[in-house]
């Protein structure tokens, strides 16, 4: 049976930065991924991002960057603006959907060991001191190197210099070859999926499952629904709807783009879910 794993990481250098990694283990193609926090989608959770394999992503604060890592895994960077980090004790949920086959959802949270409240995190000051020590150390090595070179040059002055014999060797053969990254390595360094609202090509993805990413299929929910999908084109965020008691859709005032989807079927509306399909509308 398909399984969803979730891993939450806190950035070592920035205590306010978190990254949620989610992956789908199972056959079939994923048509949409939804990431929410505070609980599963549609059950008290608040939507953070929706990722489509071809059409890109939509995200809402505090999500900073959502991207595909492989055909079946995604990552979401979060920026916590608050002084006290609410992410530390928060549950993050990822839902992988394949229309009309079904959807699978799992939740996870930051491991207790990495909770800033439980283990004293490195403060910015020691980090700066460590950097300073590195700079000073490097400076010392360079100064010592320069002194040593001067010493060698002085010794060289006092020695008789041997005469160089003329050579028929082509001077070009003695030219040093400049080092530069190859096209292949440059291409490897470029990540086409690092930006938001980007599309991705499943055929080109080959990123391996990172070592040590634990599978956490807690609260796994499977919605069997009964086969696959395809689509393409750019993103366009739409207007807004607000929930009304027993109202299906009720239109509200304009909302700035990407502030969140706005169609609510019923009260207490938060969180998302998604899959795929294409309307040939002109």
């Amino acid at each position: 049976t398909p399984e969803v794993w979730v891993q939450v990481q806190m950035e070592a250098t920035e205590l306010s930065s978190f990254t949620v990694h989610c992956g789908f283990l199972g056959p079939g193609s994923i048509s949409l991924v939804t990431v929410s926090w505070g609980g599963p989608d549609g059950a008290g959770g608040t939507k953070l991002a929706v990722l489509h394999p071809e059409l890109g992503t939509r995200q809402w604060a505090p999500a900073r960057q959502a991207r595909w890592e492989t055909q079946s895994s995604i990552s979401l960077a979060l920026e916590d603006s608050g002084a006290s980090s609410p992410f530390a004790n928060t549950t993050f949920c990822c839902k992988f959907a394949s229309f009309p086959e079904g959807s699978w959802e799992s939740c996870g949270s930051l491991p207790p060991s990495s909770d800033p409240g439980l283990s004293a995190p490195p403060t910015p000051v020691p980090i700066l001191r460590a950097d300073l020590a590195g700079i000073l150390g490097l400076s010392g090595v360079l100064l010592f190197g320069c002194g040593y070179l001067l010493h060698l040059l002085r010794r060289q002055k006092h020695r008789p210099t041997p005469r160089l014999q003329p050579s028929h060797t082509n001077s070009q053969a003695l030219t040093a070859q400049a080092w530069a990254p190859s096209q292949a390595s440059q291409a490897a360094l470029h990540d086409p999926y690092a930006t938001i609202n980007t599309s991705f090509c499943p055929a080109t993805l080959d990123t391996a499952h990172p070592n040590g990413w634990a599978s956490l299929p807690t609260h796994a929910a499977h919605q069997p629904q009964g086969p696959a999908a395809s689509a393409s084109t750019p993103i366009l965020a739409r207007g807004s709807f607000v929930s009304v008691e027993n109202g299906l859709y009720t239109q509200a005032g304009e909302r700035p783009p990407h502030t969140g989807p706005g169609l609510t079927l019923f009260p207490d509306c938060r969180g998302p879910r998604a899959v795929e399909g294409r309307f040939g509308v002109r």
Epitope: S31, F99, S240, G262, R270
Partner: nanobody, 121 residues
Framework: DVQLVESGGGSVQAGGSLRLSCVAS????????MGWFRQAPGKEHEGVAH???????RYVDSVKGRFTISQDHAKNTLYLQMNSLKPEDSATYYC???????????????WGQGTQVTVSS
């Protein structure tokens, strides 16, 4: 969790009509659009029609002028009135709620079990 229950499917002769209904209940997730998808055996699924946040109905070219999508807020129900049915309209029809990625695309977030529509010539 959300429940979308379709009804109204059945068998009909070419040129006939059917009205599909979808009742939404226990839905607590904000979405951008609600509509109908269909899938015929051995074929890719396709979006038939949807209503998005601007309230304007949108249709796939093959059903324009024949199908009408509408909703009843009081009953939390979505409808698809299908007239002048053709054999190629035969498929399982799914009611979906989802997210907009562009004007003519509603990415299903939740969907029902589907209702079968068979049109004989």
């Amino acid at each position: 969790d959300v429940q979308l229950v379709e009804s109204g499917g059945g068998s009909v002769q070419a040129g006939g009509s059917l009205r599909l209904s979808c009742v939404a209940s226990r839905y607590t997730s904000r979405t951008d659009c609600m509509g109908w998808f269909r899938q015929a055996p051995g074929k890719e699924h396709e979006g038939v029609a949807h209503i998005d946040s601007d309230g304007i109905p949108r249709y796939v070219d093959s059903v324009k002028g024949r199908f009408t999508i509408s909703q009843d807020h009081a009953k939390n129900t979505l409808y698809l009135q299908m007239n002048s049915l053709k054999p190629e309209d035969s498929a399982t029809y799914y009611c979906v709620v989802g997210f907009k990625f562009d004007d003519d695309y509603c990415a299903p977030n939740d969907w029902g079990q589907g209702t079968q529509v068979t049109v004989s010539s």
